[in-house]
Amino acid sequence: EPPTACREKQYLINSQCCSLCQPGQKLVSDCTEFTETECLPCSESEFLDTWNRETRCHQHKYCDPNLGLQVQQKGTSETDTICTCEEGLHCTSESCESCVPHRSCLPGFGVKQIATGVSDTICEPCPVGFFSNVSSAFEKCRPWTSCETKDLVVQQAGTNKTDVVCGPQDRQR
């Protein structure tokens, strides 16, 4: 009785269970009752990452420098190339097909998380007691200067964009 289902790492073809090709190899010819499945290794620029019956290997991803991409991990016969973005850029999507410059955090906002090749800068508003007076992709909110520790007094209050202005204490005679 011909099989209707096959074991793991097998496939059903013309009432016959054949072994799938292992990762890194493509199918050349189905098995027969007498012959094992014929598989061939993928060429240097190609890969297959699963047990398969593909007759063509997939091309490795190309990390196009014109799109700001560079190779993070070279592909093998079993894995695709992993691209990342050049310094100052990050991927536009999870598949990292192109790059855009990191955004800067505007005055009044500080960097919560510095951008990587795959994620953009995360900004946060400077809370009371902190400020940022620059547009930056690296700088966090800085604390207001503590006038007291310098034996000074606050002459002008700080904001989320400006530091406090300290001045000498008025000495009453």
């Epitope: 013309n14 027969t32 007498f34 012959t35 094992e36």
Partner: antibody, heavy 117, light 109 residues
Framework: QVQLVESGGGVVQPGRSLRLSCAAS????????MHWVRQAPGKGLEWVAV????????YYADSVKGRFTISRDNSKNTLYLQMNSLRAEDTAVYYC??????????WGQGTMVTVSS | EIVLTQSPGTLSLSPGERATLSCRAS???????LAWYQQKPGQAPRLLIY???ARANGIPDRFSGSGSGTDFTLTISRLEPEDFAVYYC??????????FGGGTKVEIK
């Protein structure tokens, strides 16, 4: 390159025995089933026998069943056909051929067996 | 046993002409497991077509196979001098035995 080379043919008297060999090279012999096919002088092709890649399954044409035995030695990359009780009608060129789901894709050049008294 | 009948027995044609060879099976050939072979005098057969219509590696595209079930055809669109030979069909779906047709000889007219 992929190649099959038969040997062992010759002239033999009726009732006697002969063993044919088929040496394989250029491919993973132990992964393929193998066939013997023969061709009598001036006639068409006749399938004789098949053996599975590991030597477990064997099938024969009715005309040779009980007289011929197909076997293989994967360590030597060689296929065999033991022919006993030979008859005049076994006179033919004997070819070995590789089994695939695409048919017999590789053939040897053949070896001539003549059964004559 | 599947019996394969090839026709015609001999085909006399000139180079450049189209050749149409027929192979008829006594019962349906499962999965179209039918192959065509070419054999020249003193040589081993050579696989041309498998699965009724797929060309084997290195076979020129003037050779084509068609058909399914019980009726199969090998067509040579424009005969070249090297195409004059004997052609055999073979079924490899239902065995034993693997059966061959009786052959068609394509000769120069």
């Amino acid at each position: 390159q992929v190649q099959l080379v038969e040997s062992g043919g010759g002239v033999v008297q009726p009732g006697r025995s002969l063993r044919l060999s088929c040496a394989a090279s250029g491919f993973t012999f132990g992964s393929y089933g193998m066939h013997w096919v023969r061709q009598a002088p001036g006639k068409g092709l006749e399938w004789v026998a098949v053996i599975s890649y590991e030597g477990v399954k064997k099938y024969y044409a009715d005309s040779v069943k009980g007289r011929f035995t197909i076997s293989r030695d994967n360590s030597k990359n060689t296929l065999y056909l033991q022919m006993n009780s030979l008859r005049a009608e076994d006179t033919a060129v004997y070819y070995c051929a590789r089994d695939t789901s695409r048919g017999h894709d590789i053939w040897g050049q053949g070896t001539m067996v003549t059964v004559s008294s | 046993e599947i019996v394969l009948t090839q026709s015609p027995g001999t085909l006399s044609l000139s180079p450049g002409e189209r050749a149409t060879l027929s192979c008829r099976a006594s019962q349906s050939v499962s999965y179209d497991y039918l192959a065509w072979y070419q054999q020249k005098p003193g040589q081993a057969p050579r696989l041309l077509i498998y699965g009724a219509s797929a060309r084997a590696n290195g076979i020129p595209d003037r050779f084509s196979g068609s058909g399914s079930g019980t009726d199969f055809t090998l067509t040579i669109s424009r005969l070249e001098p090297e195409d004059f030979a004997v052609y055999y069909c073979q079924q490899y779906a239902d065995y034993p035995p693997f059966t061959f047709g009786g052959g068609t000889k394509v000769e120069i007219k």
